[in-house]
């Protein structure tokens, strides 16, 4: 007789995630020296260990531990890069400018990007059916602390000048609910962290309008302002034309406004 | 605290000379890092970029192409701008402005706050 399975109401665990962990974690440490003590089995087995077996609308910061410990990585901490609905920008940007970084630009970032997984309670297995949607479930459901856990961190370790990339299409620009606005923003250390300067990106060609006067953006700048942190902003007009100008600032487009 | 600090400006006969300088705060950033420009606004007109430079790459307003020279001296953290036959059209605001990456693709990183540039006939 087939074991009833409990129906969640988001996608099931990606396929081979096992492997794809795996595999991620050793393209990841060969390619990143300071990365190399690492042990990809011993991070498998921590990642596994901390949703196996468990409720998936049960899980804690602390399932997360072991292998927060395992994948701990020292980033410069003046080079951070936060985004918020706007990802693939922000991972091209940090593919050129190579000493900023991006959560996905660390291991535990990388190991995660894309993917979705939970288990069963009292069971070895692995969901490949289902896992819970944190609207329509549950929150604490094993991606989403694994997301909140080490947005935290990552957000706990910048210091100097902290960037984020905004997407100027949303109708929130800025969303008290997104991972940024729900949990790194009030993770910056005001003791370490100067000023966080968002690059708010537009969307249309003919959009010209200053969007760092959006209403959102002023409730960033509130929330921030009031934990003691300078805020600025910046418009990024034309994202291509950004994107071409990190890559070589030399370009004679560059020094021209056309 | 004031970034970008503009010198040089003044009232001039047309067919003179003036040398515009810009001077950065060495703690907030160095020029040579930067993407330096000039910009004038005349009254009733938009702002627009007439010379900017980074590293070997310089570019020039055709208005002012052959006139207007934009230099720097990095030991200094200074951009200049040297202004040759100048005409009554010439007359504006002149501002300094910097970027990390470039000009023209979003709002710039730092502005002067502007010197008068007057060309009488």
């Known amino acids: 007789v087939p074991r009833w399975r409990q129906q969640w109401s988001g996608p099931g665990t990606t396929k081979r995630f096992p492997e794809t962990v795996l595999a991620r974690c050793v393209k990841y440490t060969e390619i990143h020296p300071e990365m190399r003590h690492v042990d990809c089995q011993s991070v498998w087995d921590a990642f596994k260990g901390a949703f196996i077996s468990k409720h998936p609308c049960n899980i804690t910061e602390e399932d997360y531990q072991p292998l927060m410990k395992l994948g701990t990585q020292t980033v410069p901490c003046n080079k951070i890069l936060l985004w918020s609905r706007i990802k693939d920008l922000a991972h091209q940007f940090t593919q050129v400018q190579r000493d900023m970084f991006t959560l996905e630009d660390t291991l535990l970032g990388y190991l995660a990007d894309d993917l979705t997984w939970c288990g069963e309670f009292n069971t070895s297995k692995i969901n490949y059916q289902s896992c819970p949607d944190w609207r329509k479930d549950c929150s604490n459901n094993p991606v989403s602390v694994f997301w909140k856990t080490v947005s935290r961190r990552f957000a706990e370790a910048a210091c100097d000048v902290v960037h984020v990339m905004l997407n100027g299409s949303r109708s929130k620009i800025f969303d008290k609910n997104s991972t940024f606005g729900s949990v790194e923003v009030h993770n910056l250390q005001p003791e370490k962290v100067q000023t966080l300067e968002a690059w708010v990106i537009h969307g249309g060609r003919e959009d010209s309008r200053d969007l760092c006067q959006d209403p959102t953006i002023k409730e960033l700048e509130s929330i921030i302002s009031k934990r003691n942190i300078q805020f600025s902003c910046k418009n990024i007009y034309r994202p291509d034309k950004f994107l071409q100008c990190v890559k070589n600032p030399e370009d004679s487009s560059c020094t021209s406004e056309i | 605290q004031v970034q970008l600090v503009e010198s040089g400006g003044g009232l001039v006969q047309a067919g003179g000379s003036l040398t515009l300088s810009c001077a950065a705060s060495?703690?907030?950033?160095?020029?040579?890092?930067?993407?330096m420009g000039w910009y004038r606004q005349a009254p009733g007109k938009q702002r627009e970029l007439i010379a900017a430079s980074r590293g070997a790459t310089t570019n020039y307003a055709d208005s002012v192409k052959g006139r207007f020279t934009i230099s720097r001296d990095n030991a200094k953290n200074t951009v200049y701008l040297q202004m040759n036959s100048l005409k009554p059209e010439d007359t504006a605001v002149y501002y300094c402005?910097?970027?990390?990456?470039?000009f023209g693709y979003g709002d710039n990183d730092y502005w002067g706050q502007g010197t008068q540039v007057t060309v009488s006939s």
């Open positions: 402005s910097a970027d990390r990456y470039g």
């Open positions: 060495r703690s907030i950033f160095e020029i040579n890092t930067m993407t």
